[in-house]
């Protein structure tokens, strides 16, 4: 057969669906690979063909669209399962072609099982709520296109295994779940089960997401350097090891990159001809505020090194700060027999 533009296996879109539930999967060609949509392709005389490779098989085979009750069907650029079965797992390919043009892409589809508490190998999206921030909502995700707007589904929300009713600060409102004032105790997995009728059958859509309560932007501050500070002096003798920790607190900020770095005499550590090592550790609070510690160490410090300026810098989306460490050379304690005796005129 003539050549086909093969976009390979698109592992970026690892699609997971629950067993025994409807699933609608759009051909990724039109969303991510081609510069035109399905309608344009269709009106230009191009045909969309679907086929698949079962799990642990190499053989590509056509999809059987003649199953009882149209269990698998295609509508425009969407492949429908009503519902899925466990052995539908595999790599699916959609190919767009006519006599002169051909383009195809494959993607993995995994049908997963869930238990009665909605636990499964499904990768869960994480929704972050700000602590004590007023009313915030989460919405039952990925249910668009499953039923027409004339159909009014029933939606039941669960936290973990428990149906949400008469919860203190969490109120189900149809497709939305409202948190009146989010607290740490609201951390957990939330599931919406959407039930709708179609052609005399009842289908269920199960969607689980993880709620993580994080620091509020109302409380966010620029980075705070706890160390070095004005109260600690790093006093060393030449030949000793110099260790200076830079400890910085960062408020949680959505999509902020938190950074800590050292400069020596205003330069990058590698621009100074001394053997410096820097080690970093990171810890998080329950609301994802972050504390970063970078320890600057010089194994055998020289008197020259003790005259240098060591500055710790920190930056987040809230701002940038810097603090110099107080470093000085220790004055050796006088040795009595030499220094003091000399003072008394001993020879």
């Amino acid at each position: 057969s003539e050549r086909c533009d093969d976009w390979g296996l698109d592992t970026m879109r690892q699609i997971q669906v629950f067993e025994d539930e409807p699933a609608r999967i759009k051909c990724p060609l039109f969303e991510h690979f081609l510069k035109f949509n399905y309608s344009t392709a269709h009106s230009a005389g191009l045909t969309l063909i679907w086929y698949w490779t079962r799990q642990d098989r190499d053989l590509e085979e056509p999809i059987n669209f003649r199953l009882p009750e149209n269990r698998i069907s295609k509508e425009k650029d969407v492949l429908w399962f009503r519902p899925t079965l466990l052995n539908d797992t595999g790599n699916y390919t959609c190919m767009l072609r006519n006599t002169t043009y051909c383009s195809k892409v494959a993607f993995p589809l995994e049908v997963v099982q869930k238990d009665s508490c909605f636990n499964s190998p499904m990768k869960l999206p994480v929704h972050k709520l700000y602590i004590e921030y007023g009313i915030q909502r989460i919405t039952c995700p990925n249910v668009d296109g499953y039923f027409p707007s004339s159909v009014k589904p029933t939606i039941t929300w669960y936290m973990g295994c428990y149906k949400i009713q008469n919860f203190n600060n969490v109120i189900p409102e149809g497709m939305n779940l409202s948190f009146l004032i989010a607290l740490i105790s609201n951390n957990g997995n939330y599931t919406c089960v959407v039930t709708y009728p179609e052609n005399g059958r009842t289908f269920h859509l199960t969607r689980t997401l993880t709620v993580k309560v994080v620091g509020s932007p109302k409380n966010a501050v620029p980075p705070v350097i706890h160390s070095p500070n004005d109260h600690v002096v790093y006093e060393k003798e030449p030949g000793e090891e110099l260790l200076i920790p830079c400890t910085v607190y960062f408020s949680f900020l959505m999509d902020s990159r938190n950074e800590v770095w050292w400069t020596i005499d205003g330069k990058k550590p590698d621009d100074i001809t001394i053997d410096v090592t820097i080690n970093e550790s990171i810890s998080h609070s329950r609301t994802e505020d972050e504390t970063r510690t970078q320890i600057l160490s010089i194994k055998k410090v020289t008197s020259e090194d003790l005259k240098r300026s060591y500055v710790c810098h920190a930056r987040s989306a809230k701002g940038e700060v810097a603090k110099a460490a107080k470093v000085k050379q220790k004055v050796p304690a006088p040795r009595y027999t030499v220094e003091l005796a000399c003072g008394f005129g001993a020879t």
């Epitope: 770095w261 590698d270 820097i278 970093e280 990171i282 940038e320």
Partner: antibody, heavy 118, light 113 residues
Framework: QVQLVQSGAEVKRPGASVKVSCKAS????????MHWVRQAPGQGLEWMGW????????DYAQKFQDRVTMTRDTSISTAYMELSRLRSDDTAVYYC???????????WGQGITVTVSS | DIVMTQSPDSLAVSLGERATINCKSS????????????LAWYKQKPGQPPKLLIY???TRESGVPDRFSGSGSGTDFTLTISSLQAEDVAVYYC?????????FGGGTKVEIK
């Protein structure tokens, strides 16, 4: 001395992926960000993203977000950039460059030519 | 995204004369807490990678001749070559690293008149 050495030229078909490497030597690999910058023939410089070799954290330009993956192997001081679903307009010289936080990109690799052609 | 606009596109200057390249950012790239402008200048010769000349808008990278200087603040920046030498023939780029995506200007080609 400080240097970044990149892998050899690549010729790829549209739809394929390319993974290029950048081996660092002469400095503490985990102490500097590694950027990837590309330059199409006769064009200017385009920043693709960076990786923090210490943590593995990345930040990609929106344009490449769903096609690029930057990784590193600290045991061999090497950074990698993989670009998938290649198109003919991805034909370019791809550079790696290091930076110490906000001090500019002070050391660059020699560049690697990736040609995408059917 | 911050857009960096360089002018002129090309510049022909006699040897020993001054060359001035401008760069304008679509938004402020000064960090108010450190008073530093997050702007770098690079020089690129054909077939070679770029070379860092200036960072923080005006700090010369070590080893860069002092005929190269950077100035400006906020949104308007200038690279000056005080006395053009033959080896300065190249394309010069400005780049902001205030916020990602870090963006480059379109480049200015400097030639000898």
């Amino acid at each position: 001395q400080v240097q970044l050495v990149q892998s050899g030229a690549e010729v790829k078909r549209p739809g394929a992926s390319v993974k290029v490497s950048c081996k660092a030597s002469g400095y503490t690999f985990t102490g500097y960000y590694m950027h990837w910058v590309r330059q199409a023939p006769g064009q200017g410089l385009e920043w693709m993203g960076w990786i923090n070799p210490y943590s593995g954290g990345t930040d990609y330009a929106q344009k490449f977000q769903d096609r690029v993956t930057m990784t590193r192997d600290t045991s061999i001081s090497t950074a990698y950039m993989e670009l998938s679903r290649l198109r003919s307009d991805d034909t370019a010289v791809y550079y790696c460059a290091r930076s110490y936080y906000y001090y500019g990109m002070d050391v660059w690799g020699q560049g690697i030519t990736v040609t995408v052609s059917s | 995204d911050i857009v960096m606009t360089q002018s002129p596109d090309s510049l022909a200057v006699s040897l020993g004369e001054r060359a001035t390249i401008n760069c304008k950012s679509s938004q402020n790239i000064i960090n108010s807490s450190t008073n530093k402008n997050y702007l770098a200048w690079y020089k690129q010769k054909p077939g070679q990678p770029p070379k860092l000349l200036i960072y923080w808008a005006s700090t010369r990278e070590s080893g860069v001749p002092d005929r190269f200087s950077g100035s400006g603040s906020g949104t308007d920046f200038t690279l000056t070559i005080s006395s053009l030498q033959a080896e300065d023939v190249a394309v010069y780029y400005c780049q902001q690293y205030y916020s990602t995506p870090f963006t480059f200007g379109g480049g200015t080609k400097v030639e000898i008149k």
